[in-house]
């Protein structure tokens, strides 16, 4: 049997990311003998559930079962039957459900209860569905990208396994943008924090990490747009909203009831003399940028330095991975290249936003109009958030890496969440064995 590989003992895990705009199911696998090693877990499948986020099913909870069926059945196909019963399934809900819980704890519990009952019907080892905190979302995103980048590995390599790896053990910061919230997480230079609420301490693989994190609820791209519309309609003279964040010639009717449905627009709510208004795009990046900046209150800061809305932010340090909607939007706009300067990004955004809507529709014929229409706003919002919100500069812009996947695994909180819940990130550095018994005999 010389040089014959023994069959590897493979383990699987499933995490459902119940986001504000949609739900995605991720399947991970790893060799059982190496589960305490760093970088051995990788994603084998992502299944995007058709439809909106679970919070939208609040009035139709009996449809949650069929909504989740296709992706759960896909997991049943991908994972060998012999492994089903020992495969853990976790569902984490993020800011969409945090917002629903703010409106009604009872309704949020009802949705989660039906989700739990639906997921319990499958042959996997269901471990529960819960709303994760913004702090957890930030922390697990940070763990995911650094795990995948090999930053927790004590073995120094003379080669680079991923494009962003600089061969040092300095961790990357994590920038996550969702539909309803955004997170910033990194290891600051100064280990003393002015704000204990934003401080996390980890011991991972024998090393201590003092991490800063904050999650800004209502500052995901979709909720930020609702906020901007609610703010701008306050000063509109009639039911026409001339909006610089949409392409010239774009028109869309918005129901005031939809606008005020979310808790994120409560601060702008007022009695309007109409039930609907029409957005008319004028496509002006500079004006859109100014409008977005009004969502960030920078006039008040009880600390040495703040992001916005009085939230402490230490000086930025090191490289950052920007993922989820940061990546999706910038990738659509073709602005993820390391070579594109911040000035160039701004120039491209000015050009993109000023393009007529009819022209845009022709250029991107395969893209759903609802999504297509919002890229001007989303791109402008990302620039505003990173530059004015988080204080990146033209110089530090080059430290932002827009990342979709690392080594085939999506950047996001789900992998870090599973690694934590399956105890696959040891506090101490595991003793390295010269050969694992799964190699060659």
């Amino acid at each position: 049997t010389q040089n014959k590989a023994l069959p590897e003992n493979i383990k699987y895990g499933i995490v459902l990311d119940a986001g504000s705009s949609h739900t995605s199911l991720y399947i991970y696998k790893w060799p059982a003998e190496k589960e305490n090693d760093t970088g051995v877990v990788h994603q084998v499948e992502e299944c995007r559930v058709k439809g909106p986020g679970i919070s939208k099913y609040v009035q139709k909870v009996n449809e949650i079962g069929i909504y989740l069926t296709d992706c759960m059945e896909r997991a049943r196909e991908v994972i060998p039957r012999s492994q089903h019963q020992e495969t853990p399934v976790y569902l984490g809900a993020t800011a969409g459900m945090r917002l629903l819980r703010m409106e009604s704890e009872e309704l949020a519990d009802r949705v989660l209860d039906v989700v739990e009952r639906s997921l319990s019907n499958y042959p996997f080892d269901f471990q529960g569905a819960r709303i994760i905190t913004g702090q957890e979302e930030g922390a697990y995103g940070w763990i995911t990208i650094n795990y995948l980048l090999g930053k927790f590995s004590q073995k120094t390599r003379w080669f680079s396994i991923v494009p962003y790896e600089t061969n040092n053990q300095e961790t990357f910061g994590a920038l996550d943008l969702g539909g309803a919230s955004t997170q910033i997480t990194f290891v600051p230079q100064n280990q003393t924090t002015e704000s204990p609420d934003n401080a996390l301490q980890f011991r991972l693989y024998g090393k201590d990490y003092n991490v800063y994190t904050h999650s800004f609820l209502c500052y995901g791209k979709d909720q930020a747009l609702w906020q901007k519309l609610a703010k701008d309609i306050q000063v509109a003279s009639n039911e026409i909203l001339r909006d610089p964040c949409f392409h010239p010639g774009y028109k869309k009717v918005v129901n005031v009831s939809d606008l005020y449905k979310t808790p994120c627009t409560k601060r702008f709510e007022m009695t309007l003399p109409f039930q609907q208004f029409e957005i008319q795009g004028i496509g002006n990046y500079q004006q859109c940028h100014q409008s977005v900046l009004e969502l960030f209150n920078t006039s008040y800061c009880p600390y040495s330095q703040c992001a916005f809305n009085g939230i402490f932010l230490p000086p930025l340090q090191g490289d950052f991975g920007a993922f989820s909607a940061f990546y999706f939007v910038m990738n659509f706009l073709n602005l993820t290249s390391e070579k594109v300067s911040q000035e160039k990004v701004t120039e491209m955004m000015k050009k993109f936003c000023s393009q007529p809507w009819e022209e845009i529709k022709t250029s991107y014929a395969g893209v759903k109009e609802k999504y297509l229409s919002e890229y001007c706003f989303s791109g402008t919002y990302i620039l505003s958030l990173l530059l004015q919100g988080y204080h990146f500069t033209a110089d530090s812009w080059e430290h932002i890496h827009f990342i979709g996947k690392i080594q085939g695994s999506d950047a996001g909180w789900t992998l870090g969440y599973m690694l934590n819940l399956t105890n696959m990130i040891p506090a101490e550095q595991p003793l390295s064995t010269p050969l694992s018994h799964s190699t060659y005999v």
């Epitope: 504000s20 705009s21 949609h22 058709k50 439809g51 909106p52 986020g53 939208k56 099913y57 009035q59 139709k60 449809e63 069929i66 909504y67 069926t69 296709d70 059945e73 969409g96 539909g179 979709d222 918005v254 129901n255 939809d258 759903k368 609802k370």
Partner: nanobody, 124 residues
């Protein structure tokens, strides 16, 4: 537009079986989900069984193990095989075809089509 036509309802005794059919016509390519709802007098309409475009199914707890939903894509027809019927299954059964919206505003469903309904009565 999609048109749905149910058939197969009727009066049966407890413990017997019925098979409902729902034939779809029109722009059925916009449809990913098909299912059966029922409404008993004085009650809300409730989802009984549903099937996805991939053929995966889901059932209300009250009918699990007794009812089976299936889909014949070639005939654009969805069926509900109802076995071991009980008096509490008495209701008007509606065929429904729909797809979910991907958006956080407006209605949950992007498309939503209903049949006229067929009466099922289970006598004891």
């Amino acid at each position: 537009q999609v048109q749905l036509q149910e058939s197969g309802g009727g009066l049966v005794q407890t413990g017997r079986s019925l098979r409902l059919s729902c034939a779809a016509s029109g722009d059925i390519f916009s449809i990913n989900y098909m299912g059966w709802y029922r409404q008993a007098p004085g009650n809300e309409r409730e989802l009984v069984a549903a099937i996805t475009g991939r053929g995966n199914t889901n059932y209300a707890d009250s009918v699990k193990g007794r009812f089976t939903i299936s889909r014949d894509n070639a005939k654009n027809t969805v069926y509900l095989q109802m076995n071991s019927l009980k008096p509490e299954d008495t209701a008007v059964y509606y065929c429904n075809a729909w797809d979910y919206s991907d958006y956080d505003e407006g209605p949950l469903r992007e498309y939503d089509y209903w049949g006229q309904g067929t009466q099922v009565t289970v006598s004891s």
